[in-house]
């Protein structure tokens, strides 16, 4: 039996990571021991799972790593990897400083809102995650058809504003569609704006007919596809 030890301490020499906002940060604590140790991460001394972080985090236990994409000022802090087994434990601290960029148009997380397929009568949630230096505002738009056309004479799509909201820069904005029908199918756009400009991302909602209960035991309410 052997207490945990660092297998590549030379890869851990860079203690302070000062990165511009919007960049990706990767912390690694490669270790070994017998029995094989587990790794946990703390932020400023508290257990860290990234649930309150826009974009979340990626924990790759086989690589002993923590990855955070599109870092923002609220990600600043001390990140501790805690490696332990039945014999003992070791820890290492990384310091993260996020250098604020110039104020920019809102950045929308890639892949959101996501293309979604749902069954008639089910409920759907479309998500939009926004990163913005300035306080952003959001609109949800549905692309509509007028007189058989999706576009006006000016070349711009016809849209209907479904929801307008001011949000905090780290919030996830959700559009709830209850009891969807075939008419709800189509293209939806999340528009985020701030004092610099607007940014858009779109997704398609496909609505399938109600499934026959005689041949399906339990259909999921909504299936999400990228």
């Amino acid at each position: 039996q052997q207490a945990p030890y660092w297998t590549h301490p030379q890869r851990m020499e860079k203690k302070l990571h000062a990165v511009p906002a919007g960049n990706t940060v990767k912390f690694r604590c490669p270790a070994a021991g017998n029995p094989t140790p587990t790794i946990r991460w703390l932020k400023d001394g508290q257990a860290f799972h990234g649930e309150n972080r826009i974009g979340g985090i990626r924990l790759r236990h086989q690589h002993w790593s923590l990855v955070m994409e599109s870092v923002v000022p609220s990600d600043r802090g001390t990140y501790t990897c805690l490696v332990e087994n039945a014999v003992g434990s070791i820890r290492y601290n990384y310091l993260l400083d996020v250098l604020e960029r110039s104020p920019h148009r809102p950045i929308l997380q890639a892949g959101l809102p996501a293309n979604t397929t749902a069954v008639v009568g089910s409920d759907v949630e479309l998500l939009c995650k926004v990163y913005s230096d300035a306080q952003p505002h959001i609109q949800w738009l549905k692309h509509i058809v007028i007189n058989g056309s999706s576009f006006g004479a000016d070349g711009f799509p016809y849209v209907q504003v479904l929801k307008t909201a001011d949000i905090n820069s780290s919030e996830v904005e959700v559009l709830y569609l209850r009891n969807v029908s075939a008419e709800d199918a189509g293209e939806y756009t999340c528009l985020a704006g701030n004092s610099i400009g607007l940014s858009y991302q779109s997704a398609w909602l496909t609505v399938l007919p109600e499934e026959d209960p005689t041949w399906t035991a339990a259909a999921p309410e909504a299936r999400y596809t990228d």
Epitope: H104, R105, S195, I196
Partner: antibody, heavy 124, light 112 residues
Amino acid sequence: EVQLLESGGGVVQPGRSLRLSCAASGFTFSSYAMHWVRQAPGKGLEWVAVISYDGSNKYYADSVKGRFTISRDNSKNTLSLQMNSLRVEDTAIYYCVRGAGRGYTRGPDGFDIWGQGTMVTVSS
Amino acid sequence: DIVMTQTPLSLSVTPGQPASISCTSSRSLLHSDGKTYVYWYVQKSGQPPQLLIYELSNRFSGVPDRFSGSGSRTDFTLKISRVEAEDVGVYYCMQYVEAPLTFGGGTKVEIK
């Protein structure tokens, strides 16, 4: 007709102050961010400052930070630029420019409407 | 800050001939939403700048179709397919991604 009309320019000595105004008409002023851009005589364009639609966010060029203050009065459809500690290099035509709106627009999201400009001369 | 570099400084064109102005940005202007936020303006003598092209290649309303914008990420071009006498002025590119918004130094277009 969408219009922006600047006023308040003039000749002022270095170190003194001046307040520029921009009167907006023909659009919902309170729904748009607004910018100031300046142009020194015979030179190019330089962005000066922006203010969000509700006045909660303001950003400035480094060259004017701490000396200029952008503000707005949505009840009067007016944008202002308070210029303190003026320097000779602040001599320029100052343009008021409409920025991004609060929502979907069928066209560019700002920097489409410019005022005629007001001349500020800083000279001893 | 994003630096916008414009070439040439000046351009003398025969009416009816094409003209091309280049603009290079120090960083990519391709935003996360897939749009490229470069704008083109013309400033005629004694007037404020007038918008010609927005979001890389979209002509602003009322702009003649002899004006076109193209490019990608950091390299952009404004083309006038057939220059007319009224096209005389100084042309500017601008990045509209982040503050401070920055402009190219300008290209003066004259008629031969």
